[in-house]
């Protein structure tokens, strides 16, 4: 009997109520592999989800996110709100990056400005909420008498050392 079921192709299921005949998957369901005893319910792309690929008898629907949101997780299991550059998502929604951090994308979290001094360099262009600092040559690399390209360091939040 098991052999009969294994002959049922994708898009069908092995119908125990009908002497293990291979029956087509009902509407809004699918089976992506052969030998299935049931068909899976198609995913519905509702709310913040939109359909990227319709469900067929052999494959599940694929969802995307509506405008203003982006996919998170395997197979776009969640839609996360977009933020503007210079912001990150928190429980309360989009918040500006804290001083010393930046985000140059519409998603993800704010991250610290690069620590130029780690590479023995100095800050050539100050960082902003949207952009990382630009590191330049170290003060020692500048010829004697040349003015340093490093702008004055901005005041820091207490307890933070972004540079």
């Amino acid at each position: 009997l098991q052999d009969l079921c294994s002959n049922c192709p994708a898009g069908t299921f092995c119908d125990n109520n009908r002497s293990q005949i291979c029956s087509p998957c009902p509407p809004n369901s699918f089976s992506s592999a052969g030998g299935q005893r049931t068909c899976d319910i198609c995913r519905q792309c509702k709310g913040v989800f939109k359909t990227r690929k319709e469900c067929s008898s052999t494959s599940n629907a694929e969802c995307d996110c509506i405008s203003g949101y982006h996919c998170l997780g395997a197979e776009c299991s969640m839609c996360e709100q977009d933020c503007k550059q210079g912001q990150e998502l928190t429980k309360k929604g989009c918040k500006d990056c804290c001083f010393g951090t930046f985000n140059d994308q519409k998603r993800g979290i704010c991250r610290p400005w690069t620590n130029c001094s780690l590479d023995g360099k100095s800050v050539l262009v100050n960082g902003t909420k949207e952009r990382d600092v630009v590191c330049g040559p170290s003060p020692a690399d500048l010829s004697p008498g040349a003015s340093s390209a490093t702008p004055p360091a901005p005041a820091r939040e207490p307890g933070h050392s972004p540079q």
């Epitope: 990150e88 998502l89 429980k91 309360k92 951090t101 979290i109 704010c110 991250r111 610290p112 400005w113």
Partner: antibody
């Protein structure tokens, strides 16, 4: 599988320094904050600071500014915390922890096993 | 300074329900997510509740989290207490998105 594996226990003299390592595996090391948290015997959790390994950017708790230094070696996916001018009150278990990139106020989803640092003369 | 205050200890009998509170002293408890960690002696903290009320895979549904804006506090509730639940529990939130804040911890004793 994501893992954070820390270096072994240390016994240090007052006034000296200690460097604790935290080797990450199972994820892209440069794309997640590593936080450093400590716990004195019988006490609660205390934030020391954090590093973004992607560019070496750091933040320090006010209490630890000037004494703690965080670095990251991206070639070995290892974060380091060095604490200088040690005193007996620094005796604690030191943890590294990873924060997901979902939101700016997210939880710590993976923790190292902890490193006991004992400061004693 | 932002502080999260937890009771030092709570105790209850097996099978009962216990609630651990986490009160924010200033600001709005709804501004940032609250997370809860369990720590057994000699072990690292593990997440029991994240983002106010979500349970990681593998955490029993006996554990639940909630936020009460009227008391400016978060709560961790454990129902059907088991002896294995005996541990320290810590709440965690933020002062700013780069400054995490922890509660002082609550020692849960399951009465034998």
């Amino acid at each position: 599988e994501v893992q954070l594996v820390q270096s072994g226990a240390e016994v240090k003299k007052p006034g000296s320094s200690v460097k604790v390592s935290c080797k990450a595996s199972g994820y892209t090391f440069t794309s997640y904050y590593i936080y450093w948290v400590r716990q004195a015997p019988g006490q609660g959790l205390e934030w020391i600071g954090n590093i973004w390994p992607g560019n070496g950017g750091t933040f320090y708790g006010e209490k630890f500014m000037g004494r703690a230094t965080f670095t990251a070696d991206t070639s070995t996916s290892t974060a380091y915390m060095e604490l200088s001018s040690l005193r007996s009150e620094d005796t604690a278990v030191y943890y590294c922890a990873r924060r997901p990139d979902y939101s700016g106020d997210d939880y710590f989803d993976y923790w190292g096993q902890g490193t006991l640092v004992t400061v004693s003369s | 300074n932002v502080m999260l205050t937890q009771p030092h200890s709570v105790s209850e009998s097996p099978g009962k329900t216990v609630t651990i509170s986490c009160k924010l002293n200033s600001g709005n408890i709804g501004s940032y997510y609250v997370h809860w960690y369990q720590q057994r002696p000699g072990s690292s903290p593990t997440t029991m509740i994240y983002r106010d009320d979500k349970r990681p895979d593998g955490v029993p549904d006996r554990f639940s989290g909630s936020i009460d804006s009227s008391s400016n506090s978060a709560s961790l509730t454990i129902s059907g207490l088991k002896t294995e639940d005996e541990a320290d529990y810590y709440c965690h939130s933020y002062d700013s998105t780069i400054t995490p804040v922890f509660g002082g911890g609550t020692k849960l004793t399951v009465l034998g």
